[in-house]
Each structure stands twice: as C-alpha cells, then as structure tokens.
C-alpha cells in the first residue's frame, strides 16, 4: 500500500522504478499543470510528507531518451 | 568481491511456507537496495520482489503479492523473502541479486531451489 | 508491462562464425541489457547501456539497435559461448526478460 518514503529510501525507490530513464526531485515544468504560477510539487512533498504509492512515485520517471543508435 | 549465497530452498506440499536467505558479503549490504529474481525449471527470469536499503519501501510482481514477504536485516547483512500460499507455478530457481545504477541486476547468487508439489 | 521478445529461440553456429540475437520490446525503451547463463550457473551481465561490454567481456560480444528492437551479436562463436542468453528491459516498471536465446555449436 501506499507508505512514506524519504533519504535514501526515496532514492532507492526512484532508481528502481524509474530504472534507465533516471527521474526528477521536481516534475518538469507545466507538468500536470496548465498554471505558470501554480507552486512547483517536488516528490519530497508529495512522498516524503505525505504517503506515495508506486504510480505517483512513477510521475517522477524521467520520459524515455530518444531512439538513436548505438 | 560481491558474494551471495541463497539457502532455504526445499521441496514444499501446496499452500505451505517456506522462508528464504541471502546472506551477502564482499559490499556494504546496508547501502543497498536488493531484489530476488526467480526462474522456473527451464524457463526464462521472472523479477519478483524489491526491497529499499533500509528496508521500508517494498514491491512485488502482481502474482506473489499478498503471499511474499521481503524483508532484511542489515545487522546481519542478511535478504529474505517469506514465501506462503506456495502454488505449483512458484517452482523456481530463487535468486537474490542486487544493483549499481545502469548495471542493472549485476550481482547474483547461486540460487536456492524451490519445489512445490504434492 | 513490456513484453520483450526475442529471436529466434534456439541457435546453431559454428565455431568461429557470427551468431547473431535478436530482442523486440513491445513497447519504446532507452535501453537494452544483456546476461548470459550457462548450465547450472546464474545469469552474468555481458552488456549494459545496449552496446556498453561488462567488466571482462571479450569485445567479441557487440550490442546496438535503439527503440524497440537490440541485437546482441558474437562476432566469432567460441566453444564457452555456449549458453542462454537474455535481453532485458529497465525503462518502465516492473523490469522484464526475454524468454532466452539457446547458443549451441553446430
């Protein structure tokens, strides 16, 4: 269920779920958002403070790079 | 060097438990997050469950929720997974493996054998 | 989840020869990763990053491809290449593996 996570239980759980793609401490700007002014949501407010499950915690993800070769 | 080493494993009846170990050296277990991997007799590598280094953030495949349990104890620099409700489909190699950002599932041990049948 | 899918299921090659491996995602990744397992031993990471070789690799092994579909190739199959090998996927949640790929000599 839904559980708090801060430090380095975040971190582990980013890099977990967020694997390759990496992930942000704060959404990418206008994320999730129409509003210039609206205050910028970080993880630690939203999982550190309050409980987070693991769909919120995947907001987080970084988007995927894009498709280049290697 | 990095060494895990699964015991516990054995033949179980249906709907029986079974608790698995890891026991980790070689790394400062405590700073790490790890995660068991399965792989049924000739088949392919199933992820099965994730525990965060200090042990309060836990995940699970959809199949094993509600019946697995991982936990650790960093005292012991010890990984276990509490397996009840076995089901014949959880027959499998268990191992325990761990991860550096990027070398994703770098670590592995020799695995423990789990047999459920009747 | 992402369903990876690779090709073909088994492979015979001879000694010295190309061996080529082939890994679809169902869906777009960043990246592919590759392990190899033979008989009685666990996976062993050969490639990280799609194309990075693993501590002590032979530079025989070679990765590439971007998106949806990886290769891994063996450019000069030797007799300890024998073994599965597996291509997985860690840009979306949960992690996944291909089903596996049998190397055998021919």
């Known amino acids: 269920g839904p559980e708090t996570l801060c430090g380095a239980e975040l971190v582990d759980a980013l890099q977990f779920v967020c694997g390759d793609r990496g992930f942000y401490f704060n959404k990418p700007t206008g994320y999730g958002s129409s509003s210039r002014r609206a205050p910028q949501t970080g993880i630690v407010d939203e999982c550190c403070f309050r409980s987070c499950d693991l769909r919120r915690l995947e907001m987080y993800c970084a988007p995927l790079k894009p498709a280049k070769s290697a | 060097e990095v060494q895990l080493v699964e015991s516990g494993g054995g033949v179980v009846q249906p709907g029986r438990s079974l608790r698995l170990s890891c026991a980790a050296s070689?790394?400062?277990?405590?700073?790490?997050?790890m995660t068991w991997v399965r792989q049924a007799p000739g088949k392919g590598l199933e992820w099965v469950a994730y525990i965060s280094s200090g042990g309060g953030s836990t995940y699970y495949r959809d199949s094993v929720k509600g019946r697995f349990t991982i936990s650790r104890d960093n005292s012991k620099n010890t990984l276990y997974l509490q397996m009840n409700s076995l089901r014949a489909e959880d027959t499998a190699v268990y191992y325990c493996?761990?991860?550096?950002?990027?070398?994703?599932?770098?670590?592995w041990g020799q695995g423990t054998l789990v047999t459920v049948s009747s | 989840d992402i369903v990876m899918t690779q090709s073909p299921d088994s492979l015979a090659v001879s000694l010295g020869e190309r061996a080529t491996i082939n890994c679809r995602a169902s869906?777009?990744?960043?990246?592919m990763h590759w392990y190899q397992q033979k008989p009685g031993q666990p996976p062993k990471l050969l490639i990280y990053g799609t194309s990075k070789l693993a501590s002590g690799v032979p530079d025989r092994f070679s990765g590439s491809g971007s998106g949806t579909d990886f290769t891994l190739t063996i450019s000069s199959l030797q007799a300890e290449d024998v073994a599965v090998y597996y291509c997985l996927q860690r840009s979306s949640y949960p992690p996944t593996f291909g089903q596996g790929t049998k190397v055998e000599i021919k």
């Open positions: 070689g790394f400062t277990f405590s700073n790490y997050y």
């Open positions: 493996t761990t991860e550096d950002y990027g070398y994703w599932f770098a670590y």
């Open positions: 869906s777009s990744v960043s990246y």
